[in-house]
């Protein structure tokens, strides 16, 4: 069975084809090759002789037991080598020779028992080494790591490391890898020698499900003293053994670390006193809790020095009390409990993401809701009912505003966005908005992107509501049940590049409303009911137009519409997916491609 | 279509069939078997995925006695610092995991419950597997 040609001459997918040897009929130009799940078993020298251009090679689950010297010799362009799930028993010293450009080596679940004997010391370009899910017992980083000066990610998770000693990290003292991210999760740790991490700098350290008791966690965290880490991730996994007890003493040792960003990811434990618990983390710049349950919500009004707070997938009794002077970014998403938003006091806040919480807002939106006048980014998408009762007083700095899939009330009663002169991006898609007021978008003089799909218009008619949006480049009006539009609806949109009118109820096509769109490149009219043209003579679309989508419409392939069908053929160079432009009527032509029709109409007496 | 039996409990019988062409082997055990009146137990899964599990989600299509419920999307793996350790599993890596579950106080009426589970993962998104579970429910008491 042949391999699947994904990108001709470049990418070949040969997964699970029961190959016992490397295929010899693929072009020399192949760059990406997936040979996973084939019983190759043995890689001799120059196994990839015929693939001089190879950049990505996936050998996952190929039952490889032996890799000989020079197996990958000649793959000087290879950047990614994946060996996941191979039961390697014999790995020659020169197994990886010739890989002078390798950046990513994945040797997950390959029976690797030690880093010491892993022959990768010459791979100077290596950025990512993933040796998770192996049998490694010692965390001693071999001397050859001093050659791996580009290493950024080392994944040692799910191994058998129990102890970390001062000598294990000696090589990092010799050549501080300023950018190294280290994942030690799911190793059964019980001892970290104090001083082992002294004066070590890491970009990221992840320790999840490493400790089987509170005491072990406490002493191991104390053993991290002296570490300088940009981002520290602690926590557990839902499907692994969890700590029975967790209290403030667990994290006391963090006072002896220098941490820029902290994240606690999943804890099967109720956090009550977060002020005491995170006492050592009051001055980290970014603080993040993922999938934890928080009892006392008032604690977030303590004087923490955080600049970024992230609360994701957490459980709260009620919406937390947030009073944080220095906070610039708040991400509060996919949380449960506390369905009603209550005011927060965050005077420095610039970025606020409150999406996917099922929250309802009694009144939105003004500076008093968020306690700031500095807000530039506000995401309230995928929430409940949001009642628009204020026109963003004090929030004039806003540049990005997203309400999609929330239920907006009172949108068509006044110019809600009147004061948002700096707004660049607005998404009100699927917000149950019924446009019945022409001034709905007044004030949005800087707006570049407007997404309003899935809403509706009075009498299914698009009026002149865009008159002030002179900088608009992207407009999505899909799924709005539109049947007609004002001939001057788009007259002021001279910068518009993309217009999506798909999934509406237009029965005819007219070029007139687009005559002023001098920058229009993409016009999508797919999934309407277009049968013919509105006027007998259709003009040309703007000369800037490059893509016109008329697929999945109800074209009437009859003589009376011959001029329209001819016009469509004349637009051939603009049309996309022409094979999906089919006749709907008459029945004998149903399903026929419009462009292949040859309608010769004669006047039959 | 070959049917794979999972388990029987006092009020339910659970089995599944594959609803995709690939039919990559997956082993599913429930201990103790689910009782629809109330249940607490462990779900054990052994599986070798054909793509990374990063950003795994399930599309659930549930049918109750021939009545179709709306499609439900259950996100399991968001893509970073996920709740489940198997979210970091790579294509070809053994997934051997136990997940605890519990629910109570749901009253199910007697009949045949079907649940098509479409597992989607990776970037670009592709189907990982598709299983159609059939639960025959015979409550002892209403």
């Amino acid at each position: 069975e042949p391999c699947v040609e994904v990108v001709p001459n470049i990418t070949y997918q040969c997964m699970e084809l029961n190959f016992y040897k490397i295929p010899d009929n693929l072009p020399f130009s192949t760059k990406n090759l997936d040979l996973s799940f084939n019983p190759l078993r043995h890689l001799g020298s120059y196994s990839f002789f015929s693939f001089p251009e190879l950049q990505v090679l996936d050998l996952s689950r190929c039952e490889i037991q032996t890799i000989e010297d020079g197996a990958y010799q000649s793959l000087s362009h290879l950047s990614t080598l994946i060996l996941t799930g191979n039961p390697i028993q014999s790995l020659a010293l020169g197994a990886f020779s010739g890989l002078s450009s390798l950046q990513k080596l994945v040797a997950v679940e390959t029976n690797l028992a030690s880093l010491e004997n892993f022959p990768i010391g010459h791979l100077k370009t290596l950025k990512e080494l993933n040796v998770a899910h192996n049998l490694i017992q010692s965390f001693k980083l071999p001397e050859y790591f001093s050659n791996l000066t580009n290493l950024e990610h080392l994944d040692l998770s799910s191994n058998k490391i129990q102890s970390i000693y001062c000598t294990d990290l000696r090589v990092l003292h010799q050549m501080p890898l300023l950018n190294l991210s280290l994942d030690l999760s799911l190793n059964p740790m019980n001892f970290i020698q104090p001083g082992a991490f002294k004066e070590i700098r890491l970009h990221k350290l992840t320790l999840r499900n490493n400790f089987d008791s509170l005491n072990v966690m406490k002493t191991c965290i104390q053993g991290l003293a002296g570490l300088e880490v940009h981002r520290l991730v602690l926590g557990e996994f839902r499907n692994e053994g969890n700590l029975e007890k967790f209290d403030k003493s667990a994290l006391e040792g963090l006072c002896n670390l220098t941490i820029e960003e902290f994240r606690l990811a999943y804890l099967d434990y109720y956090l009550d006193d977060i002020i005491d618990l995170f006492n050592c983390l009051t001055n980290v710049s970014s603080f993040s809790l993922v999938s934890v349950t928080i009892e006392r919500v008032k604690d977030f009004s303590y004087n923490f020095g955080w600049q970024h707070l992230e609360l994701v997938n957490c459980k709260f009794g009620q919406f937390p009390t947030l009073k944080l002077k220095s906070l610039k970014r708040l991400t509060f998403t996919s949380n449960k409990g506390g369905n009603a938003f209550s005011e927060v006091d965050l005077p420095s806040l610039e970025f606020l993401d409150l999406s996917r919480n099922g929250l309802s807002f009694k009144g939105c939106c003004s500076q008093s809701d968020f306690g700031t006048t500095s807000l530039k980014y506000l995401d309230l998408s995928f929430n409940g009912v949001i009642t628009m009762s204020s026109n963003f007083l004090g929030l004039e700095q806003l540049e990005h505003l997203d309400f999609q899939h929330s239920n907006l009330k009172q949108m068509s009663e006044f110019s809600v966005f009147l004061s948002l002169r700096n707004l660049i991006y607005l998404d009100i898609s699927h917000t149950h908005t019924r446009v019945a007021f022409n001034g709905i978008f007044n004030g949005l003089s800087s707006l570049e992107v407007l997404k309003m799909a899935g809403n509706s218009f009075q009498e299914n008619f698009l009026p002149d509501i865009f008159t002030e949006l002179r900088n608009l480049t992207f407009l999505d009006l899909s799924q709005c049940q539109l049947e007609q539009l004002s001939p001057t609806a788009f007259n002021s949109l001279s910068s518009l590049q993309v217009l999506n009118m798909s999934h509406n109820n237009f029965f005819s096509l007219d070029t007139f409303p687009y005559k002023c769109l001098n920058s229009l490149q993409v016009l999508d009219y797919s999934l309407n009911h277009i049968m013919t043209s509105k006027k007998q003579e259709l003009q040309h679309f703007p000369s800037s137009l490059a893509f016109l989508n008329l697929t999945q419409n109800d074209f009437a392939c009859t003589c009376e519409h011959q001029s329209f069908l001819q016009w469509i053929k004349d637009q051939r160079q603009l049309l996309v997916e022409v094979e999906r432009m089919e006749c709907a009527t008459p029945s004998d032509k149903q399903g026929m491609p419009v462009l292949s029709l040859n309608i010769t109409c004669q006047m039959n007496k | 279509q070959k049917q794979y039996w999972v388990c029987n409990s006092s009020d339910a019988s659970i089995s599944y069939t594959y609803c995709d062409k690939m039919q990559y082997p997956i082993s599913i055990n429930v201990n103790p078997c689910i009782e629809l009146k109330r249940s607490k137990g462990l779900l054990h899964i052994f599986y070798i995925p054909r793509r990374d599990l990063k950003q795994l989600y399930f599309n659930l299509y549930i049918t109750v006695n021939t009545m179709n419920l709306p499609k439900r999307k259950e996100v399991i793996c968001r893509g970073s610092d996920d709740d489940y350790s198997f979210c970091r599993a790579l294509k070809g890596e053994t997934v051997n995991t136990t997940i605890s579950f519990s629910f109570k106080g749901i009253k199910f009426s007697k009949g045949k419950y079907k649940c098509v589970v479409e597992a989607i993962s990776g970037s670009p998104e592709e189907m990982l597997f598709c299983l159609e579970f059939v639960i025959l429910h015979q409550p002892n008491s209403n």
């Epitope: 490397i22 010899d24 020399f28 001799g44 120059y46 002789f49 015929s50 | -």
Partner: nanobody, 117 residues
Framework: EVQLVESGGGLVQPGGSLRLSCAAS????????MGWFRQAPGKEREHVAL????????YYADSVKGRFTISRDNAKNTVYLQMNSLKPEDTAVYYC??????????WGQGTQVTVSS
């Protein structure tokens, strides 16, 4: 078993030309691809050019594109490498290699090419 014998190497001035030959014998029916590699002192062996016996498709390393030409004469079981506009950095031992369907790679003994004024 496949035997490969190279010839045609030597000393040449920058800008000059050489033509290398590689004669194959033995189980030549099993050969899929043939090619030329080179190894400069202290460096790893690298691809120069490849040719597929079945359909004649060809590959050249970027460093020799437009200067070197690989060709084959099936009747003589020989592969050639025509090297024009030679540069000092082309100095190396040039090896002929053949890849069979077994899969196995056979090598010639190598021929020295020196580009120097």
């Amino acid at each position: 078993e496949v035997q490969l014998v190279e010839s045609g190497g030597g000393l040449v001035q920058p800008g000059g030309s050489l033509r290398l030959s590689c004669a194959a014998s033995g189980s030549i029916f099993s050969i899929n691809d043939m090619g030329w590699f080179r190894q400069a002192p202290g460096k790893e062996r690298e691809h120069v050019a490849l040719i597929r016996i079945k359909d004649g498709s060809i590959y050249y390393a970027d460093s020799v594109k437009g200067r070197f030409t690989i060709s084959r004469d099936n009747a003589k079981n020989t592969v050639y490498l025509q090297m024009n506009s030679l540069k000092p950095e082309d100095t190396a031992v040039y090896y002929c290699a053949a890849k069979t369907g077994t899969p196995f790679v056979y090598w010639g003994q190598g021929t020295q090419v020196t580009v120097s004024s």
